[in-house]
Interface confidence: medium
């Protein structure tokens, strides 16, 4: 069965239709296209011979249009005027004419919307929104987008004078968009241009970089404080809750023990008139704010039960430190057999027992800091009766 | 019964002129593209020119381009081939022939029985 | 020289299948329907194929039509005394915007 089918159905004024043609049959020797629900000579748009791959006028035709080989019709730039019915003739090789009929609807097109706010400049957690999409137009579709994406489901999101307008109740930092809004009728759709919110909020608690507590004496002290804030946050500096200035930045040069104290960071926002402040304790010391890892070595690591005995020596070039043991996580001593000597660096064991064997480590560490040395695995073994010239039976 | 009878053909002249006609009987001549085709003496069959039903479309061979011109009166039911500046080798019989896809896919069905153009000195 | 090409000659035997060849090009045979004629001597040529392979009514199907690329073929089986004739393919050439014939092939049936 022949068919037509208008691709699409529905046709922006001004845009392009495609006539298609379904179940052509194989062997044609031509067809012609028709405005109108019937073959009239005199409504004839256009006729297309297959042999001489050639197309012919006819009296309806505009000069907008255009046939394929496949039969499909395309008319370009179209008018309401074009709304209606188009009919098909087929020439086929048995000298059988078929004929179909199709239709198609011609729309205006949609202009390109705008958002219009009550509000570009909201306070967090204080202002709400309404944006309206204009201009308002019969037989329309509105939509918004919120960063390229379809409204979230939110009971902060509310939807009013047929979608055409969105309220943002309470704003916060990030609902800044961009928000777009749409238009759609059946043939064509347009969007805004994107409109952003400037949201006023913060400062929320500062943060002092770097983390650090503790500095060596003659290093330089050098701390920066950051809060998210719109605008900006104005910054000051406290030490010992003396006022010392106002910036973000706070640089001591050649610090002394006398430098030790709290710092803190204050930030303000002039336009919510808001402050939040943060305090950072700094320690100046001579001891080493990092333990270098240190290592273990055993005079021997493989021993005879009851007979052997072995020591475990923790080596470590920090100084003003503390040295403690481990084995399978408990400390030692724990047995009478075990001694530590020369400021803990040394652990002895002697004799070496069954229960000796296992995993040995050492932790290194002073007031401020702290680092423990790789596991050393103690085996202890138990002779069998002894063979007459060490030999192994044969 | 559909039939198609050619005339005017006779001896004429290099150079000369001369005037064909087909006349349709047995079925609605508008409906149809007509052809002329020619075959000299001895040889084999060589397409002259179409025209389709309504005359708005025409195509003619190369050898005749600017020199035969085809055309029709339905009101009559006639095609007519005028001959103009003819040369020897025009002579041949010209049939008139029914096309009956409407010139979508030329292929002739029904052929008069043709008339001798003969172009001789 | 004709633009489709056929043998001059072909024959056969009565009862025999005969085959007539016709080559053409993309432009004619390849892209456009083909007919085939019938010319006995001393008469206007006579439709027996078009659209490659359809026979108009009253054609016997002992003559079929075929086409393959930029050839096609006529083949007459129980080859028949009467069937002693020229034959010519035809077909719409789209670069020449012209109708188009093979030379012709002159059929001897034998015996």
């Known amino acids: 069965q022949l068919t037509t089918e208008s691709m699409p159905f529905n046709v922006a004024e001004g845009k392009e239709v495609l006539l298609l043609v379904h179940n052509l049959p194989q062997q044609l020797f031509g067809y012609s296209w028709y405005k109108g629900e019937r073959v009239d000579g005199n409504r004839q748009i256009v006729g297309y011979a297959i042999g001489t791959q050639q197309a012919t006028p006819g009296p309806a035709n505009s000069g907008r249009e255009t046939i394929y080989p496949n039969a499909s019709l395309l008319i370009q730039n179209v008018t309401q005027n074009d709304t209606g019915f188009y009919t098909l003739q087929v020439i086929k090789s048995d000298l059988v004419n078929e004929e179909a009929t199709g239709q198609f609807h011609v729309y205006p097109e949609l202009p390109k919307p705008s958002i219009s706010s009550n509000n570009s400049n909201p306070v967090e957690d204080k202002d709400a929104v309404a944006f309206t999409c204009e201009p308002e137009t019969q037989d329309t579709t509105y939509l918004w987008w919120i960063n390229n994406q379809s409204l979230p489901v939110s009971p902060r999101l509310q939807l009013s004078n047929g979608n055409r307008t969105l309220t943002l109740l309470s704003v916060t930092r990030n609902d800044t968009g961009p928000y777009e809004c749409e238009i759609q009728n059946p043939v064509s759709a347009n969007r805004s241009d994107p409109v952003t919110l400037n949201v006023t909020y913060g400062p929320d608690t500062p943060t002092i970089s770097p983390s650090d507590t503790y500095y060596r004496p003659g290093a330089n002290l050098s701390l920066s404080c950051y809060a998210a804030s719109n605008p900006p946050a104005q910054y000051s500096w406290l030490i010992n809750g003396t006022f010392q200035q106002s910036t973000q930045e706070l640089f001591i040069p050649n610090i002394t023990v006398n430098n030790s104290g709290s710092y803190t960071c204050h930030a303000n926002n002039s336009v919510t008139g808001c402050n939040r402040t943060t305090v950072k304790t700094i320690i100046v010391t001579e001891l080493s704010p990092v333990v270098a890892k240190p290592q273990i070595k055993a005079s021997k690591t493989t021993v005879t039960g009851d007979k052997d005995s072995v020591n475990l020596t923790c080596s470590t070039n920090d100084t003003g430190i503390s040295i403690r043991w481990f084995f399978k996580n408990q400390s030692l001593p724990s047995s009478e057999r075990m001694k530590l000597s020369q400021g803990n660096t040394t652990l002895s064991i002697n004799p070496v027992k069954r229960e000796d064997a296992g995993t040995y480590w050492c932790e290194v560490f002073n007031p401020i800091s702290k680092n423990q040395s790789d596991p050393i695995m103690l085996n202890v073994n138990y002779n069998a009766l002894p063979q007459e010239n060490g030999l192994s039976p044969g | 019964e559909v039939q198609l009878l050619e005339s005017g053909g006779g001896l004429v002249q290099p150079g000369g002129s001369l005037r064909l006609s087909c006349a349709a009987s047995g079925f609605t001549f508008s409906n149809y593209a007509m052809s002329w085709v020619r075959q000299a003496p001895g040889k084999g069959l060589e397409w002259v020119s179409v025209?389709?039903?309504?005359?708005?479309?025409?195509y003619y061979a190369d050898s005749v381009k600017g020199r035969l011109t085809i055309s029709r009166d339905n009101s009559k039911n006639t095609l007519y081939l005028q001959m103009n500046s003819l040369r020897a080798e025009d002579t041949a019989v010209y049939y008139c022939?029914?096309?009956?896809?409407?010139?979508?896919?030329?292929?002739?069905?029904?052929w008069g029985q043709g008339t001798l153009v003969t172009v001789s000195s | 020289q004709s633009v489709l090409t056929q043998p001059p000659s072909a024959s056969g035997t009565p009862g025999q299948r005969v085959t007539i060849s016709c080559s053409g090009s993309s432009s004619n045979i390849g892209n456009n329907y083909v007919s085939w004629y019938q010319q006995l001597p001393g008469t206007a040529p006579k439709l027996l194929i078009y659209?490659?392979?359809k026979r108009p009514s009253g054609v016997p199907d002992r003559f079929s039509g075929s086409k393959s690329g930029t050839s096609a073929s006529l083949a007459i089986s129980g080859l028949r005394s009467e069937d002693e004739a020229d034959y010519y393919c035809?077909?719409?050439?789209?670069?020449?915007?012209?109708?188009?014939f093979g030379g012709g092939t002159k059929l001897t049936v034998l015996g």
């Open positions: 025209i389709s039903h309504g005359g708005g479309s025409i």
């Open positions: 035809g077909a719409w050439d789209s670069m020449g915007n012209g109708y188009v």
């Open positions: 659209a490659d392979s």
């Open positions: 022939a029914r096309d009956p896809t409407k010139g979508y896919a030329p292929t002739f069905d029904y």
